[in-house]
């Protein structure tokens, strides 16, 4: 014998209190598949969460995070704060990158500047908290007449380009 509830489409539920007829999901609830005996409560996007997609009778609401935060976890279950460029998120909040490291994004960790000398190159532009070092030609390429590029003068302030 076929289960009469199997005929109930998404957006409805099989109402046992009404001879198993298909009733529409009540407001703020949904059923995403047919044959359901209950409708699920819609997710509410509150606080630091904001609504990306409204709940309908057949699909749950979808949330994302308010500006200054980004999603983590399945279905954006958590909101993690953004940091500024030149910072990294630590357990105690956003902290500036230590000297010799940089972060050019709003998330992720500070990474060490490129060591130009490992590739036999010179530093063309000093690194900052927000930007990596730019490596220039190798010193051997800078023989007189070979190039008009000259190595930069040492920065006065560590980690920053000369003003």
């Amino acid at each position: 014998l076929q289960d009469p509830c199997s005929n109930c489409p998404a957006g409805t539920f099989c109402d046992n209190n009404r001879n198993q007829i298909c009733s529409p999901c009540p407001p703020n609830s949904f059923s995403s598949a047919g044959g359901q005996r209950t409708c699920d409560i819609c997710r509410q996007c509150k606080g630091v969460f904001r609504t990306r997609k409204e709940c309908s009778s057949t699909s749950n609401a979808e949330c994302d995070c308010t500006p200054g935060f980004h999603c983590l976890g399945a279905g954006c279950s958590m909101c993690e704060q953004d940091c500024k460029q030149g910072q990294e998120l630590t357990k105690k909040g956003c902290k500036d990158c230590c000297f010799g490291t940089f972060n050019d994004q709003k998330r992720g960790i500070c990474r060490p500047w490129t060591n130009c000398s490992l590739d036999g190159k010179s530093v063309l532009v000093n690194g900052t908290k927000e930007r990596d070092v730019v490596c220039g030609p190798s010193p051997a390429d800078l023989s007189p007449g070979a190039s008009s590029v000259t190595p930069p003068a040492p920065a006065r302030e560590p980690g920053h380009s000369p003003q």
Partner: nanobody, 124 residues
Framework: EVQLLESGGGLVQPGGSLRLSCAAS????????MSWVRQAPEKGLEWVSA????????YYADSVKGRFTISRDNSKNTLYLQMDSLKAEDTAVYYC?????????????????WGQGTTVTVSS
């Protein structure tokens, strides 16, 4: 599959206590530091506490120091958070999180797996 499942949340009055548990599976539990992190209704994630893989080192956010105690039972693959002297501002969803290394500290933010969370409401 790596999984973390929190339990123990609920409604408690200010000054009361709760003990949260986090059951871990799918990885060598004792090889990884673990953290508790929370998200209050209007705020982003806030790190609460961390414990090293062996359980010998523990760390706490200033906001919970002296009130919360983190522990682990590696034979049961379970992480705990004992919360005493609870305040209204402790109301949040609490997540346990696996860190990427055995040792931990109160600085580096390297959680790589999260549970689904358990809700703690502190209200009179």
């Amino acid at each position: 599959e790596v999984q973390l499942l929190e339990s123990g949340g609920g409604l408690v009055q200010p000054g009361g206590s709760l003990r949260l548990s986090c059951a871990a599976s799918g990885f060598t539990f004792s090889s990884y530091a673990m953290s508790w992190v929370r998200q209050a209704p209007e705020k982003g994630l806030e790190w609460v506490s961390a414990i090293s893989g062996g359980g010998g080192s523990t760390y706490y956010a200033d906001s919970v120091k002296g009130r919360f105690t983190i522990s682990r039972d590696n034979s049961k693959n379970t992480l705990y958070l004992q919360m005493d002297s609870l305040k209204a501002e402790d109301t949040a969803v609490y997540y346990c999180a696996k860190e990427g290394t055995t040792e931990t500290d109160d600085y580096h933010y390297n959680m790589d797996v999260w549970g689904q969370g358990t809700t703690v409401t502190v209200s009179s």
